[in-house]
Structures are given as structure tokens and as C-alpha cells.
């Protein structure tokens, strides 16, 4: 059984950096394994080597550790439009990203989806598309921003936020998201 994280941290703090307490003998500090390897056997005693083995294909460790198993490599999620930027190595997980002219939208800390950058048709680019943020568009007069596209004011219903933006006016307005459409 793996001890709770707090217990492991407590045990590690007794040893100098780069070492950990032997699980069966708390007077012995063993050297941690380098990244790209995992703990096969604890060191037999003080000053003796920890038995570390290289991670097998499809697994990795990205930092020094005393893990009994390497971590499984992540797979890029094709259904989310993700592409592989760099493949998994023994000391680095797979890096996933998006294609050119796309941005990442994080639904949660560990899940992102790739979407096409908005082109700002019927408007101008206020802020360019970035890795983790869509283009920010400013709509021309007579248009309002809905789902990050500039839509004609003829499509504005009285019940929607766009009524403020679609009042007769001469100067350009910076579109604000129409909150009544999702």
C-alpha cells in the first residue's frame, strides 16, 4: 500500500534533497532515481546504490522520483482536434497542441479543445488570435458580436443584449458578447 502523500512528504523531508527515506528502515536515506527511470529496488543500506530502471516504451518520469512505476504517456485527443507537437520520451510526456490558425479552449484543467480562430468578417481584429485565446473582434457599425462573429443588426431580437449595440449610430462599436444566445 502506498502511504498518503502527506506521510511521504514528511518522510522525504528528513533526508537531504535528492534522497528519500527507505520505506522499511527510516535511518537510511536512498538516492532518488533520475528522470526517465523508476524505482526497481530500494538501496540496501547507507551509501549503497538505489536500483533504478529505465522507463519502458509508452511510459515516462519527468523528474527525479522514487516511483514504483513510470507514468503512462498521454495520448492526444483527436476528437478534440488535438495534434501531437512532440512524442513521449522516457523523461517527457507527449505534448499536444492545435493546428495553425486554431486556439486552445480549456474546458477543465486537463482537457482542451481546438477551435478555429475567428476571422472578424464584418469587423476588424482588435486582438490577434493566440495559443489559448480566440481573436477579439470589433464589429463594424450595423453589426453586433454573437459567438465571436459579427452578425447583422437585422438579426437582433428585442429580447437580446444586442439591442444596446444596434441602436442607430454613426461610429463603430466594439462588440460585446451577446449573452442571450447560448
Amino acid at each position: 500500500l502506498v502511504p498518503p502523500l502527506r506521510d511521504r512528504e514528511k518522510r522525504d523531508s528528513v533526508c537531504p534533497q535528492g534522497k528519500y527515506i527507505h520505506p522499511q528502515n527510516n535511518s537510511v536515506c536512498c538516492t532518488k532515481c533520475h528522470k526517465g527511470t523508476y524505482l526497481y529496488n530500494d538501496c540496501p543500506g547507507p551509501g549503497q546504490d538505489t536500483d533504478c530502471r529505465e522507463c519502458e516504451s509508452g511510459s515516462f518520469t519527468a523528474s527525479e522520483n522514487h516511483l514504483r512505476h513510470c507514468l503512462s504517456c498521454s495520448k492526444c485527443r483527436k476528437e478534440m482536434g488535438q495534434v501531437e507537437i512532440s512524442s513521449c520520451t522516457v523523461d517527457r510526456d507527449t505534448v499536444c497542441g492545435c493546428r495553425k490558425n486554431q486556439y486552445r479552449y480549456y474546458w477543465s484543467e486537463n482537457l482542451f479543445q481546438c477551435f478555429n480562430c475567428s476571422l472578424c468578417l464584418n469587423g476588424t481584429v482588435h486582438l490577434s488570435c493566440q495559443e489559448k485565446q480566440n481573436t477579439v473582434c470589433t464589429c463594424h457599425a450595423g453589426f453586433f458580436l454573437r459567438e465571436n462573429e459579427c452578425v447583422s443588426c437585422s438579426n437582433c431580437k428585442k429580447t437580446l443584449e444586442c439591442t444596446k449595440l444596434c441602436l442607430p449610430q454613426t461610429e463603430n462599436v466594439k462588440g460585446t458578447e451577446d449573452s442571450g444566445t447560448t
Epitope: R77, K78, E79, Y105, W107, Q113, F115, E147
Partner: nanobody, 119 residues
Framework: EVQLLESGGGLVQPGGSLRLSCAAS????????MVWVRQAPGKGLEWVSH????????FYADSVKGRFTISRDNSKNTLYLQMNSLRAEDTAVYYC????????????WGQGTLVTVSS
């Protein structure tokens, strides 16, 4: 016209189980990635799980991993969410939805089914 209709919610005690269903129509169900999201009282939408059409692993949020199982029956155009070891924090309205395509919003989702976990 796309229609998604959830069912199976209800009141359950902590540690209990529920199975949610989502009947889909108006599109080619077998070709679409399907999603379960939830909204707890006073909170925003949380992505729970999704399942691609075929051949790829489902995704689970860390908060439900090991407890919830998503599945689909393409012959019945139905999406499922098996929820075990339920906790008070799982209390929410659960919605099924089609994976968004145009941008980070849901064009198509159901009316939701309420799951209440309480003793």
C-alpha cells in the same frame, strides 16, 4: 431537428448508484462525440465525461474518475452515465450534449436531469 432527452435522475443516498440515459434524435448519433456536463446549485458548468464515436478512450474529469462510466448504444441512439459511489458534491443537474464544433459553447444539449445525493 436535434433533440436530446435525459432521464434517470433522482434522490440517492451517499455511496449509492444511478444510471442516467440520454435519448438522441435528429442527427447521426453514431458519428458524434457525446458529452455529459453538470451544473451544481450556484456553480458553473462542469465537464464530466465524453465518449468519441468509436475506437478512442472516453474522457473523465478527475472528480469522477473511477466512479462514473460513460457508454453509448449506437443502435439505440442512447448515451449512458453509470454513477457509482455517489457523493454529496455530485448533486447537480446533468445534461447530455453534442461536442461543440464551432466554438466553446453548446449548440445542442438537453433539458437536464436532477441528481440529488443526500442522506
Amino acid at each position: 431537428e436535434v433533440q436530446l432527452l435525459e432521464s434517470g435522475g433522482g434522490l440517492v443516498q451517499p455511496g449509492g448508484s444511478l444510471r442516467l440515459s440520454c435519448a438522441a434524435s435528429g442527427f447521426t448519433f453514431a458519428h458524434e462525440t457525446m458529452v455529459w456536463v453538470r451544473q451544481a446549485p450556484g456553480k458553473g458548468l462542469e465537464w464530466v465525461s465524453h465518449i468519441p464515436p468509436v475506437g478512442q478512450d472516453p474522457f473523465y474529469a478527475d472528480s469522477v474518475k473511477g466512479r462514473f462510466t460513460i457508454s453509448r448504444d449506437n443502435s439505440k441512439n442512447t448515451l449512458y452515465l453509470q454513477m457509482n459511489s455517489l457523493r454529496a458534491e455530485d448533486t447537480a443537474v446533468y445534461y447530455c450534449a453534442l461536442l461543440p464544433k464551432r466554438g466553446p459553447w453548446f449548440d445542442y444539449w438537453g433539458q437536464g436531469t436532477l441528481v440529488t445525493v443526500s442522506s
